[in-house]
Amino acid sequence: ECVTQLLKDTCFEGGDITTVFTPSAKYCQVVCTYHPRCLLFTFTAESPSEDPTRWFTCVLKDSVTETLPRVNRTAAISGYSFKQCSHQISACNKDIYVDLDMKGINYNSSVAKSAQECQERCTDDVHCHFFTYATRQFPSLEHRNICLLKHTQTGTPTRITKLDKVVSGFSLKSCALSNLACIRDIFPNTVFADSNIDSVMAPDAFVCGRICTHHPGCLFFTFFSQEWPKESQRNLCLLKTSESGLPSTRIKKSKALSGFSLQSCRHSIPVFCHSSFYHDTDFLGEELDIVAAKSHEACQKLCTNAVRCQFFTYTPAQASCNEGKGKCYLKLSSNGSPTKILHGRGGISGYTLRLCKMDNECTTKIKPRIVGGTASVRGEWPWQVTLHTTSPTQRHLCGGSIIGNQWILTAAHCFYGVESPKILRVYSGILNQSEIKEDTSFFGVQEIIIHDQYKMAESGYDIALLKLETTVNYTDSQRPICLPSKGDRNVIYTDCWVTGWGYRKLRDKIQNTLQKAKIPLVTNEECQKRYRGHKITHKMICAGYREGGKDACKGDSGGPLSCKHNEVWHLVGITSWGEGCAQRERPGVYTNVVEYVDWILEKTQAV
């Protein structure tokens, strides 16, 4: 059962796993949620009745019954992890804590103009977990405006104390705000020879990489595959670090793979969710339960629904035994990974999907693409919205994309002549325009935010945000699309689609069914040659076939150019302008979203 509220002046008795320090009860709850075993916690707030050495302690707890006895204690705040909840969870913490000094290893000290600049510095430093900034009112003159970057083994402070005129906060890497390079390459036959900070067992290099990504100290990893010659090291995942933040060298070793933490780009790839099944593989660990199950998929569901289950092994039924049901072994360990992995015993293993909600909603796998045909099917493009105007009569105005639970990204040129957001309606989860009736639910628009450098589509900055009056509840038919990562500017997208209800030819009408077309990207140099009278800037991106025939057209404006990369869909472009529609050697021109990520984040995260 999901319990989100915090229990004031209440302490849970027993069940202690470990104690960490957090600046607030809210953050203690997040730490508990991300800890592999924590189900409950007790946080001690600052209080004259409490020993100051106990202030800001966050005791992580576990219980077989999923609850513990409650005791009244002033200044104690207790609660449950969000593991039991189905809603989206994020480790992103933008809060700034005034008059708190978060202790850790101070490895970098520099002058900064503001706490925000200090936080940005921390976010863009590979080692930084949190920071403390001495404001200009700080008593000691030589420490004023000093930004201390800090790290610890756990990623949380080793202690927190009260200190006047300082502020502290966390790195925003988990908010996808880092400008650090995102190195997605996996290196076969390679070992990185640097300090091991931890080691876990993993079924493959991808799981090893994901574990590295959400381990606070891991910057890169080496994984020994099941063919590794030394039996005791097979399936071993070594989590590594170095002073420079990069491996000092690469050593060639057969049957080993190495790679990097994806902490700088984790918003656009699943990190916590290990959804694959591992055949002829047994995961060893502490046994939680043994249940009969019809299939390994059913076993995974059982594990996902059992809040303490972290991974499982399913042994298929022997011939006619037990009504064709096999045995489902639900398991757990201290770190969430198997204690040993064995092969050749016929088991099928996997992980709980409970952690999938800790990944950005935009990374969720959606319905597979329907190949061929131009009409979409329901749920194929769940981020696509239809934006209607009600003045003078109701009609489809533009497309748009869901990028957050209160935000639609679209084109600025859609709002020519739109005097007020009151006349706008956003419909999501729509396949056919004919579904929209008087009583069809929609989202009202609270605010239209047009880029302040926008003048006309052809000169760029053709981008706008719509803030919705109410939040979107994510479902299979309405969910967000990932923004491209700034570290991915080098990525070559090869699987790009434009979608919309727009015209199918220049003189036409709005289509009833959402249309789709796969379109190749065109280099800006090539695009510039096709539009000699215009300036194709790096803030634009072009797509189209040389021979024409497939393109966005009137009514598609503001809609997405969606590209699939590493199994995740990214909003690469916003349909903006072009010469005619689908004309030979006239590619469509789109707003290059990656160039506006900072602007989007600035506007959507403004308080």
Partner: antibody, heavy 118, light 107 residues
Framework: EVQLLESGGGLVQPGGSLRLSCAAS????????MAWVRQAPGKGLEWVSS????????LYADSVKGRFTISRDNSKNTLYLQMNSLRAEDTAVYYC???????????WGQGTLVTVSS | DIQMTQSPSSVSASVGDRVTITCRAS??????LAWYQQRPGKAPKLLIY???TLQSGVPSRFSGSGSGTDFTLTINSLQPEDFATYYC?????????FGQGTRLEIK
């Protein structure tokens, strides 16, 4: 057919700078690690620098560390080598090459000559 | 860092001969060694990797052997186009190092 075409070489004074380019075609450039290898006149081969497919990690020989910068633009299928603070001993033919899973240089360009002399 | 030493620095032979070039690593490199051929005025060409695996398209008269620190490249029945300079390269770890080269010339 894999093709690597270097350009940008020439005569430069000691302390000067030069930027080499390598245009790649005939393979998926963004999937390959790339490298620069040089050969001084009448001498052997010397590995200079490597860059991973994403461009996020670069490695250098000690002899060029801090002076040379390798980079790539996957959208243009091009590899670069920015050479600063050039010395007479940097005079060589500079080759661009693909680095394969075999840990060997699979394909090479024809090379571009860099002469550092006053 | 690993150093590579080739011997001899040059060798003379005739068409049809069998030639062996050796390469020694300053420390054990398992079988992680590559061999290259470079004809005058041309770019090097990968012949062998992992000490003994022939790169596709390379004639079978070329063969490699060895592991640890000592390696050999053998060319059976020399052809006119084989007269070139040969380099070994350690593929064990970065920084990558080449041998100084062995010039194979016509006797």
């Amino acid at each position: 057919e894999v093709q690597l075409l270097e350009s940008g070489g020439g005569l430069v004074q000691p302390g000067g700078s030069l930027r080499l380019s390598c245009a790649a075609s005939g393979f998926t450039f963004s999937d390959y690690e790339m490298a620069w290898v040089r050969q001084a006149p009448g001498k052997g081969l010397e590995w200079v620098s490597s860059i991973v497919p994403s461009g996020g990690w670069t490695l250098y020989a000690d002899s060029v560390k801090g002076r040379f910068t390798i980079s790539r633009d996957n959208s243009k299928n091009t590899l670069y080598l920015q050479m600063n603070s050039l010395r007479a001993e940097d005079t060589a033919v500079y080759y661009c090459a693909t680095w394969g899973d075999s840990w060997g240089f699979d394909f090479w360009g024809q090379g571009t000559l860099v002469t550092v002399s006053s | 860092d690993i150093q590579m030493t080739q011997s001899p620095s040059s060798v003379s032979a005739s068409v049809g001969d069998r030639v062996t070039i050796t390469c020694r690593a300053s420390q054990g490199i398992s079988s992680w060694l590559a061999w290259y051929q470079q004809r005058p005025g041309k770019a090097p060409k990968l012949l062998i990797y992992d000490a003994s695996t022939l790169q596709s398209g390379v004639p079978s008269r070329f063969s490699g052997s060895g592991s640890g620190t000592d390696f050999t490249l053998t060319i059976n029945s020399l052809q006119p186009e084989d007269f070139a300079t040969y380099y070994c390269q350690q593929a064990d770890s970065f920084p990558i190092a080449f041998g100084q080269g062995t010039r194979l010339e016509i006797k």
